[in-house]
Interface confidence: low
């Protein structure tokens, strides 16, 4: 008769570092001990006739153990495969680019330690919850590729990688870890420069707007500008309006950057730079100053007129060039009544680059003089009727202006000047018109005839 | 540990200028962003600009345009701000922040510096 | 600018009480690449604002759960499940899709 031994329980399968409990039991009436053949930490729990009971601990990889026994003088044997599961201990996604070309392909890695059965274990990359590769586990430490093509869409998007240990068929459920996720920022630059809007000419410590633009970037958000004048840096403002980037600044030139610059404009996004170059002119153009030698001069004195301006600067006085640019225009008069008043121009002109540039300046020039009344305009013998209505016109100058009085000889009657007034008879007589300033007095006579009006 | 150590209060004449600095440590200074922040009694919390350390290049509120000036010293980890022409309304406290691209939130945030202007 | 408005102004509750916190934005917080750039912040007296959740609902390293962010486009709301000690302080949204970034009001909560 042929007895057996069997081994419970049969082809176990547990997680990394369990513990196991296995009977060994046989239906020989006369066997010995029976002994249990393992690699594995074991302990005698228990035995009777035809049974034994023994404890495994800390079962950490796949195992055979064997039962024997003697029976009638033969040994018999039983055996038992222990499968043994564990979850991986990383599960690693690689760092992706800092900054991913749209329409370009990338690599994901994922690196997987440890995970037991591999047979069982298959590793997913994924796209937010999309999957882009599913693949077994196999080598130690597994290693796992897909190449993606990079998107608009995928900027901002997670990827990540997780693995899958089915022991499903087994009963024990499917177990899922994921790695951290890694967030993708991809970038669409044009090839083409940046549209540069900035003056062909910038006068010293003058200040004018320059506008860098660059269309077809994206994320517009993202790019940095770099906006400057020689090797001074611009203060820019930047402004997105969906894929358009502008970026404003203010260009002020400093006295020591005179003669030619470049304007510079440089946009960088995802490590790579768009750069576009403007030429300036940095001018200095002072003046023209135009001065007199006595801004208020007395009737018959001399006077200089100057009119002076920058080195370079051709200038000219009442049409009257200097002798060369760089030097001053000058001229010089007696002062007289008639040049109370009269303004003096100069024109400046300055070559930048091929282009003139004019600018032009004034001074007024005040003279001096006693009063005077123009005879002209008063007339020294009137003959108006009675009860009509007239106006004295008698005018008087000088610098400072005079005032001008009519006084009737013998009273301290007084006629308006310049104002419409009934005349009657008593207006009859001489006057003294007086035309006084700080500058002295001036007299003319004036007589009045008043013709009594006569009703027949 | 990522740490932002910024400089002590300052106390200014109006019409004056104030540097103030943020010193980052425990993480690479060039991979984020430096922000500031401005808190005021009666303005809350107010964001000033941004500067991105690797390339030096700046974004500001226009509100603090010619007021702010953000610069970095890539060789000491360390961010400055000057504010130029104080005036009383520039009372507050300032606090530099830094932001990863993501999540693009301020992350980590100094323990502000206060400047008080004052005749 | 996008001008953020929190309600309300001051929120006195219980500890263990639940609380809520809103926040609207004047224009829509959706970036171009389809990623909402709202976040939430607290400041503890005499401290420095920290981050709780970033970009509406993910919270930040060492934020508790009790912590909750949710919302879309213009509105959005932060919700704490059970209010502790340890909470107690001033909350500012703040928004960076757009330029300049902006920060709501704030809300104090408070002990009853």
């Known amino acids: 008769q042929e007895f057996l031994l069997r081994v419970e329980p049969q082809n176990p399968v547990l997680s990394a570092g369990g513990s196991l409990f296995v009977n060994c039991s046989t239906d020989c009436p006369s066997s010995e001990k029976i002994a249990l053949e393992t690699s594995l930490s074991k302990e005698l729990v228990a035995s009777g006739m035809g049974w034994a009971a023994f404890n495994l601990s800390n079962v950490t990889g796949n195992s055979r153990i064997l039962c024997s026994v003697y029976c009638n003088g033969s040994q018999i044997t039983g055996s038992s495969n222990i499968t043994v599961y564990g979850l991986p201990e990383r599960v690693e996604l690689a760092p992706l680019p800092p900054w991913q070309p749209v329409g370009q392909n990338f690599t994901l890695r994922c690196q997987v330690e440890g995970g037991s059965p591999r047979t069982s274990l298959t590793v997913v990359l994924l796209r937010w919850e999309e999957e882009l590769s599913r693949q077994p586990a196999v080598e130690e430490p597994a290693e796992v590729t897909a190449t993606v093509l990079a998107s608009r869409d995928d900027h901002g998007a997670p990827f990540s990688c997780r693995t899958e240990l089915d022991m499903q068929p087994q009963g024990l459920g499917l177990f899922v870890n994921t790695s951290a996720p890694r967030q993708l920022r991809t970038f669409v630059l044009p090839v083409t420069p940046p549209r540069l809007v900035a003056p062909r000419f910038l006068e010293v410590e003058t200040s004018w707007p320059v506008d860098c633009t660059l269309d077809g970037l994206f994320p517009a958000s993202e790019a940095q500008v770099y906006l400057a004048l020689g090797d001074q840096m611009l203060n820019a403002t930047v402004m997105n309006h969906g894929d358009t980037l502008t970026a404003t600044a203010t260009a002020t030139a400093r006295a020591d950057q005179e003669g030619a610059r470049e304007i510079v404009c440089n946009v960088t996004l995802g490590g790579e730079r768009r750069e576009a170059r403007e030429n300036l002119t940095v001018f200095s153009f002072l003046g023209p100053i135009v001065n007199l030698s006595e801004p208020t001069a007395h009737e018959g004195s001399t006077v200089t007129v100057s009119c002076m301006a920058g080195a370079r600067v051709q200038v000219t006085l009442d049409g009257v060039p200097a002798a060369a640019p760089g030097q001053t225009a000058q001229l010089q008069l007696n002062a007289t009544e008639s040049d109370d008043g009269r303004s003096f121009f100069c024109s400046a002109t300055l070559e930048v680059d091929g282009e003139f540039l004019h600018r032009n300046s004034s001074v007024q020039l005040r003279v001096l003089y006693g009063p005077k009344i123009d005879r002209a305009t008063c007339p020294q013998h009137l003959k108006w009727k009675d009860k009509t209505r007239h106006v004295l016109q008698c005018q008087a100058r000088g610098n400072p202006y005079p005032e001008l009085r009519c006084l009737k000889e013998g009273s301290s009657r007084e006629v308006p000047v310049g104002i419409p007034f009934f005349v009657n008879v008593t207006h009859n007589g001489t006057y003294q018109c007086q035309a006084s300033s700080s500058r002295g007095k001036y007299t003319l006579v004036v007589v009045m005839d008043i013709e009594a009006f006569s009703s027949h | 540990e990522v740490q932002l150590q910024q400089s002590g209060p300052e106390l200014v004449k109006p019409g004056a200028s104030v540097k103030i600095s943020c010193k980052a440590s425990g993480y690479t200074f060039t991979d984020c962003i430096i922000l500031w922040v401005k808190q005021s009694h009666g303005k809350g919390l107010e964001w000033i600009g941004k500067?991105?350390?690797?390339?030096?290049?700046?974004t500001y509120n226009l509100k603090f345009k010619g007021k702010a000036t953000l610069t970095v010293d890539k060789s000491s980890s360390t961010a400055h701000m000057q504010l130029n022409s104080l005036t009383s309304e520039d009372s507050a406290v300032y606090y530099c922040a830094r932001k990863e691209a993501y999540p693009d939130a301020m992350d980590y945030w100094g323990q502000g510096t206060s400047v008080t202007v004052s005749s | 600018d996008a001008v953020m408005t929190q309600t309300p102004l001051s929120l006195p509750v219980s500890l263990g009480d639940q609380a809520s916190i809103s926040c609207r934005s004047s224009?829509?917080?959706?970036?171009?690449?389809?990623?909402?750039?709202l976040h939430w912040y607290l400041q503890k007296p005499g401290q420095s604002p920290q981050l709780l959740i970033y970009?509406?609902?993910n919270r930040f390293s060492g934020v508790p759960d009790r912590f909750s962010g949710s919302g879309s486009g213009t509105d959005f709301t932060l919700k704490l499940s059970r209010v502790e000690a340890e909470d107690l302080g001033v909350y500012f949204c703040?928004?960076?899709?757009?330029?300049?970034?902006?920060f709501g009001g704030g809300t104090k909560l408070e002990i009853k």
């Open positions: 970009k509406v609902s």
């Open positions: 224009q829509s917080l959706v970036h171009s690449n389809g990623d909402t750039y």
């Open positions: 500067i991105n350390p690797y390339f030096g290049t700046t």
């Open positions: 703040s928004q960076s899709t757009h330029v300049p970034y902006t």
